[in-house]
Every structure is written in structure tokens, then in C-alpha cells.
């Protein structure tokens, strides 16, 4: 039969070459002298020549060493041919396989892998995965098949066995209790790759484990105690710094520290805040202390982690005694803004008021007063007792200085210290009415028409307050009654002035006399001009003739 | 020499709670892991829990997790286990054991947890 | 059902050998060298007897040793003794929260 069975040639073989692989024979060379060849990838095409057949014997030769990693199975055409070159069968399939030898060293896909894990975990965790790779074949045979192993460790603390690898897939886990980066940040590991499942050929890499942090250290006070000297009333004065130390990783959530104060500030007077580089805890007064309420705080301060702790520590607390120092404070007025009621146009030389400043400081000092701001220069203030009297005319009609009835004046104490210090006070008069003005119309200048003249309606004012106001009264004085008439509306606050005789056309004095509702009078005189028409009139028609 | 003390066991109905101690002595307690390791009446040995040397990881075998946590106290040298919601099948002595690496050494004497109404 | 598979007894005369087996897969007992043996007497704690495959802490018996072939392991006792009578079980590692494994145990019964 015109078939062959596959071939199995072992790559790397050492000849002599050409070797004889197999004889191609066709049960049709009883009849005719038959001729062979051999086509295909390796006979006539790339790569040309690795394998002939001898023409007339049919044998099949290999010319030269195979390499199974370069091609592991070639694919031929066996032909038969007659004497005259006439096909005598059909083309027959040659197939040739190339049995692998362990001719290749497993080889690790990098000279140095990196991994990390972090510190205290139990074994069993995963780190990273390592691959060697072999080209040899791994299906059919040993020769590609590669076991991992941990050749070494350094360092070799707290023991030599801190990792194991899987040996098929080279997961690299922890095999023991006590990673702590503390004690060793970074291990290096030798791995090895051996082929054959282990017992070949060997290559060697580099595994680094890093080990991470975890927060497993507490920060500490170091020192633990502190002596701090603050001046009283001084706000966001730096108090103390508090130094710890953490054996955690610098500038890490682990290592940071945050603050508390557990106790001893019972008024909320401190604050403390973490130094972003130094990681101190400044302590500083969030409100001014007092040394005559309390000339000594004792603080307790406890630090902890921006992380928080993965296991159960015993935190570190810093005693802070805070010794307040006595400045010398200046008087405060009682009360700072003072409320006096007092009646307008009082007498020179009347007592206003008495105004005086306490002094926070323990010691008794002498306090003396002055008068910082008087702007009409209506008052005096004793120095030593802080009496304010009248040295002007309080008037409560006067706009320029007199809001709303009350008149502002600042006053100053100062102590005797060494250095003396100043404390104000603002007085506050609320003037009192007196009915110290009269009424007064409005306008004082009239035009009227001495036919058929239409009535005057003048708007009567009064600086002072009710009561001494409203309603007023009118009245006219000298004559003026004789061609003039004056009345009150109902409602008291303005007044009718009517011409009742004719009066030639001229300018006249109207005597008009008010009186409010305390009958304090106001005489005003009233320019009326007469003109010669009808009604109503806003100036007079023609040329004016004074009279 | 180097002793493992469990105690805290006893009899306690199903849906309550008992808390183990493991006191140790004669080695490093921190430098080690430690696990609680149980065994029923008649049956073999099961892990239960385990804890790393700081502290800071912890295992469990799926039929406690969620009802029992071990936690330690480095400073005092002991192992504990928190177990609530037991159940019968929590009935069993209870070891507490040491290991470096991966295997138990040293053990606990054990303590007898049943769980009975 | 144990992770590791353990015959549940086996028995031999004094002064015989014996190999209990441990079996296991290619994750644990076939991808590392961490398979450990205890003894335990009745009513006793449990002791480590090898680790590592075949490592004797001090004060074990040479009597006592460990093989590992693919996935299963091997305790070995030559020269079988009355206290050598105890059940036996293996653990191994493997990677993952579940990093021992026991075996269901073999109880050593000397005739």
C-alpha cells in the first residue's frame, strides 16, 4: 500500500546525516522501475532541503539536525512516478513529527518582580504571582513544565520562612506570623523555575516584597509633661508645642496625629491643631485667659492617628500646666454704654450724672477720668470721681449735635499702672423736653388780592414735644385785628389769616401772636403784600407801589 | 516552658453567648498567630478562627462567620473568643494553638463549650 | 467533609510499619511543602509530630516520618508501639482565609 505512518524524529539528533527515516515504496515497481520524490514546506519550498528522498530506493533522509521549538511538525507530498515520468500514484501524505528534548532553560518573564503586603497579615495572604516561561513542550512531556520555588530570603527575620510559592503557578503568599515593616520594610526573595516539574534545568529571578504600612503603632508623647507661661487675655496665643513620635510610615494617614484635649478646659478657652510637617500639636487659646479667675489650667491632651488603629493601643495623653501671667488690664466702664436721662437747658455747674470704670486687676489702682469726645463742649467730668456736669446749655432742639433726643459723648478711665492703660465708655443724655420754644408760622410772607381776597392757610411749627405743642392758639396784637382776622383749625396746627377791610394796594406788618399748648408765646410778624385784584394771587399785577 | 490555659467554656443555651480566654506563657506571644481549633464529640478537628501576632488580621471559617470574633490582648498575653447566636452544632471543646508558620504548635488543654437547652 | 482525604483507620501489629495517607489536591498538598502531622491520644490535646513534610521537632521519635508524592502526603511509623495507638491528622497549607486544612483524621490501631 502507497501510506506511511507518521514519523517521530527527536529534534537535536547528532547523525550522521543524511539519516535514513523511512522507505516510500509503491507496490506498482513489480510492473515498471519506479521513480520518488518529495514535495512540500522542508523538501523544495522554505525551508528547502531539511529532508530528500533517495530516487530510485524511496528512502526518506534527514539532512540535518530538527529543532522543535522552530518547527515541530512537517507536512510532505511522497510522489511515485514511472520511467516516462507518468504519475503511478497519488500523491501520499508524509507527516513528521518533532519530539522535543529538554534543550531550553525555563526563563523568567523579568529579572526582578516587585509585590507588596501589608505588615501583620496571617498567612495565607497573597502577594504577587511570578512566570517563568520554557519553550519546550509542557503537553506530551516534563521538559516544559515548570516548578517554582524560593531559593532564599533576605533578610531572614524574624524567620527564614516568611513566604512560600505555589509551584505550578508562582504565587508568591505569606506563609508566617510577624511581617512588621517597622523591623523590615522590604524582603527579597531568590526564586527559582526548574523544569522537568522540578527536576531540571534551573533559572533563577528576584522577588521584592515591599511591606506596606499598617496602623499598628500608636503615636507617643515625648516628653509627656509640660510647663507653659501664657499672659492673660491674649486670643490664639500659641501655648506650647506637643511633640510625639510614631513608628508608623512618616507623612502617612498612620503616622499624622490629631489632637484631642480630654479635659482640665472646662470654658472652652484652648484649641489645638496638628503642624502639617513637624506633625506637633499646637496648642493654642481659642478666648483670652483670666488671671484673677484663674491663674492656672491643668490640660489633658490624647493623641491618636488620622488612620485609625488596626488593632486594639493603648493611646498617649500629655499633661499641659498652663501658669497665667497678670497683665496689667484696663478699666472697663459699668455698664460699657450708659443710659442718662436729663433735662435740656439745665443750669451750669448741675450734676449730668456719675460714671465710673471698674479695674479687672486685683491690685487696687487708681482710676482717673476725662471727658475723649464732647462735641457741643456741654459737659465737664471730675477726674477722680468720674461726676459729669453741665458746663453749656444741653439743648435738645439742636440738630447739629442731638440725634433722636440723645446726645453721645465718649468718655476715657485710665489706671496707673506701669504701663498705665485706658478703658472707654460711651454716656448716652437723653435729653429731656422743655417747652422752651414757641410756635412759629409758616410762610411769613404773603400775597393777597384786597377784592374778594381768598384765605391764608399758614402751618404753625414747634421745635419742642408734645405736649408742649399742639393745639395752639392765635391771637393779633397791635392793631392788626382791625383789617386782619386769625383762627385756629380744628385740629390746632395751622392758621387762617383773612383780610376783613380793604386795604389799598401796599406791603403791611400783620402782629400774629402763638401760643402752644404749655402757652408759651411767639410773637411773628407776617409781610402781607396787597394787591390791587380778584381772588387768587401769586405776585401783583403792574408795577409795585410801596406803602 | 511554653503553655497554652484555655478557659470560659461551659453549658449555655442555644442563642446565648460565652466569651473563651487562652492565657499564654513561656514565648513570645506576639511574635505568634494564633488560632482556636474545635472538636466535637466523636468527630475530628476543625479550624474555627485565627488571628495574626498585632492583631490586626483576623480569619474565620465560614460556619462561625458573623457570630464569633477572636481578638487578643498582647499586653496581657491572652487569646480571646467572643461567641454569640451558638448553636448545637457549636457543641465542642474548644483549643486555642500557636503557629509561627503554618503549622499548630503549641496547643491549649481545651475547654468544653455544649450548647443545650 | 474534610478539605484533605485521610483513611478513617488503620492497624498494625507492635513492631510493624505503617503509612497513613493524606490526600489532597494540586492548591494545597501538591503546590506546597507545609503538610503537618499531630497525634492526639484521647482526651488529649493535640501534638505536632512533623511539619514541613518531614521535619521532627525535638523530642518526636525517628520512628515517625513524612513523605509527599503529587498531591498526597505520607506519615510513615516503623516499629509500632502500644502509644503509638492515637488518631492521627494531617493539615496543609493553602493560599486564601481558610489556610489550613485538616484532614477528617485516621485513627492508629496497634493489635
Known amino acids: 500500500d502507497w501510506v506511511v505512518a507518521p514519523i517521530s524524529v527527536p529534534e537535536n539528533g547528532k547523525g550522521p546525516f543524511p539519516q535514513r527515516l523511512n522507505q516510500l515504496k509503491s507496490n506498482k515497481d513489480r510492473d515498471t522501475k519506479i521513480f520518488y520524490s518529495i514535495t512540500g514546506p522542508g523538501a523544495d519550498s522554505p525551508p528547502e532541503g531539511v529532508f530528500a528522498v533517495e530516487k530510485e530506493t524511496g528512502w526518506l533522509l534527514l539532512n540535518k539536525p530538527l529543532d522543535r521549538e522552530e518547527i515541530a511538525k512537517y507536512e510532505l507530498f511522497g510522489h511515485a512516478v514511472s520511467e516516462n515520468g507518468a504519475s503511478v500514484e497519488d500523491p501520499m501524505n508524509i507527516s513528521i513529527i518533532v519530539t522535543d528534548q529538554n534543550d531550553h532553560k525555563p526563563k523568567f518573564t523579568q529579572d526582578t518582580f516587585r509585590g507588596s503586603v501589608l505588615e501583620g497579615v496571617l498567612p495565607g495572604t497573597s502577594v504577587m504571582q511570578v512566570t517563568a516561561t520554557d519553550e519546550d513542550d509542557a503537553i506530551y512531556t516534563y521538559n516544559g513544565v515548570v516548578a517554582y520555588s524560593i531559593h532564599s530570603q533576605e533578610p531572614k527575620d524574624p524567620h527564614d520562612l516568611m513566604f512560600t510559592i505555589h509551584r505550578s503557578t508562582g504565587t508568591i503568599s505569606v506563609i508566617s506570623s510577624g511581617l512588621d515593616r517597622e523591623k523590615v520594610p522590604e524582603y527579597t526573595l531568590t526564586i527559582q523555575a526548574t523544569d522537568m516539574d522540578g527536576d531540571g534545568s534551573t533559572t533563577t529571578a528576584v522577588a521584592v516584597v515591599e511591606i506596606l504600612d499598617a496602623n499598628d503603632n500608636a503615636p507617643m508623647f515625648d516628653p509627656q509633661k509640660y510647663e507653659a507661661h501664657v499672659p492673660e487675655n491674649a486670643v490664639g496665643h500659641e501655648v506650647q508645642r506637643l511633640t510625639v513620635t510614631d513608628l508608623d510610615a512618616p507623612n502617612s494617614p498612620a503616622w499624622r496625629a490629631t489632637y484631642l484635649i480630654m479635659g482640665g478646659d472646662d470654658g472652652d478657652h484652648f484649641t489645638i491643631t496638628t503642624h502639617p510637617e513637624s506633625n506637633q500639636g499646637i496648642l493654642t487659646t481659642r478666648k483670652g485667659l483670666d488671671f484673677e479667675a484663674k491663674n492656672q489650667h491643668t490640660l489633658y491632651v490624647e493623641v491618636t492617628n488620622e488612620a485609625p488603629f488596626v488593632l486594639k493601643l493603648p493611646t498617649s495623653t500629655a499633661t499641659i500646666v498652663v501658669h497665667v501671667e497678670d497683665v496689667n488690664e484696663a478699666p472697663v466702664f459699668v455698664p460699657p454704654s450708659k443710659v442718662v436721662e436729663v433735662q435740656e437747658g439745665i443750669p451750669t455747674g448741675e450734676p449730668v450724672c456719675v460714671y465710673t470704670a471698674e479695674d479687672p486687676d486685683k491690685e487696687n489702682q487708681k482710676i482717673s477720668y476725662r471727658i475723649l469726645r464732647d462735641p457741643a463742649g456741654w459737659l465737664a467730668m471730675d477726674p477722680d470721681s468720674g461726676q459729669v456736669t453741665a458746663v453749656g446749655t444741653l439743648d435738645r432742639e439742636d440738630e447739629q449735635f442731638v440725634r433722636n433726643n440723645i446726645y453721645e459723648v465718649m468718655v476715657l478711665a485710665m489706671d496707673n499702672g506701669s504701663p498705665p492703660t485706658t478703658g472707654t465708655g460711651t454716656l448716652l443724655l437723653t435729653l429731656i423736653d422743655v417747652n422752651d420754644h414757641g410756635p412759629v408760622p409758616e410762610p411769613r410772607q404773603i400775597t393777597i388780592c384786597n377784592q374778594s381776597p381768598v384765605r391764608q392757610v399758614l402751618n404753625i411749627t414747634d421745635k419742642d414735644l408734645s405736649p408742649h405743642t399742639s393745639p395752639f392758639q392765635a391771637q393779633l396784637t397791635d392793631d392788626s385785628d382791625i383789617y386782619w382776622t386769625a383762627e385756629v383749625n380744628e385740629e390746632g396746627d395751622t392758621v387762617v389769616l383773612s383780610l376783613k377791610k380793604f386795604l389799598k394796594q401796599d406791603t403791611y406788618d400783620v402782629h400774629l401772636s402763638l401760643s402752644d399748648h404749655g402757652n408759651k408765646e411767639q410773637l411773628t410778624v407776617i409781610r402781607a403784600t396787597v394787591c390791587d385784584c380778584h381772588g387768587h394771587v401769586e405776585t401783583c399785577p403792574g408795577p409795585w407801589k410801596g406803602g | 516552658e511554653v503553655q497554652l490555659l484555655e478557659s470560659g467554656g461551659g453549658l449555655v443555651q442555644p442563642g446565648g453567648s460565652l466569651r473563651l480566654s487562652c492565657a499564654a506563657s513561656?514565648?513570645?506571644?506576639?511574635?505568634?498567630?494564633m488560632s482556636w481549633v474545635r472538636q466535637a464529640p466523636g468527630k475530628g478537628l476543625e479550624w474555627v478562627s485565627a488571628i495574626s501576632g498585632s492583631g490586626g488580621s483576623t480569619y474565620y471559617a465560614d460556619s462561625v462567620k458573623g457570630r464569633f470574633a477572636i481578638s487578643r490582648d498582647n499586653s496581657k498575653n491572652t487569646l480571646y473568643l467572643q461567641m454569640n447566636s451558638l448553636r448545637a452544632e457549636d457543641t465542642a471543646v474548644y483549643y486555642c494553638?500557636?503557629?509561627?508558620?503554618?503549622?499548630?504548635?503549641?496547643w491549649g488543654q481545651g475547654t468544653m463549650v455544649t450548647v443545650s437547652s | 467533609q474534610s478539605a484533605l482525604t485521610q483513611p478513617a483507620s488503620v492497624s498494625g501489629s507492635p513492631g510493624q510499619s505503617i503509612t497513613i495517607s493524606c490526600t489532597g489536591t494540586s492548591n494545597d498538598v501538591g503546590a506546597y511543602n507545609y503538610v503537618s502531622w499531630y497525634q492526639q491520644h484521647p482526651g488529649k490535646a493535640p501534638k505536632l509530630i512533623l511539619s514541613e513534610v518531614n521535619k521532627r521537632p525535638s523530642g518526636v521519635s525517628n520512628r515517625f516520618s513524612g513523605s509527599k508524592s503529587g498531591n498526597t502526603a505520607s506519615l510513615s511509623i516503623s516499629g509500632l508501639q502500644a502509644e503509638d495507638e492515637a488518631d492521627y491528622y494531617c493539615t496543609s497549607y493553602t493560599m486564601g482565609s481558610t489556610f489550613m486544612l485538616f484532614g477528617g483524621g485516621t485513627k492508629l490501631t496497634v493489635l
Open positions: 494553638a500557636g503557629s509561627r508558620t503554618v503549622q499548630f504548635d503549641p
Open positions: 513561656g514565648f513570645t506571644f506576639s511574635s505568634y498567630a
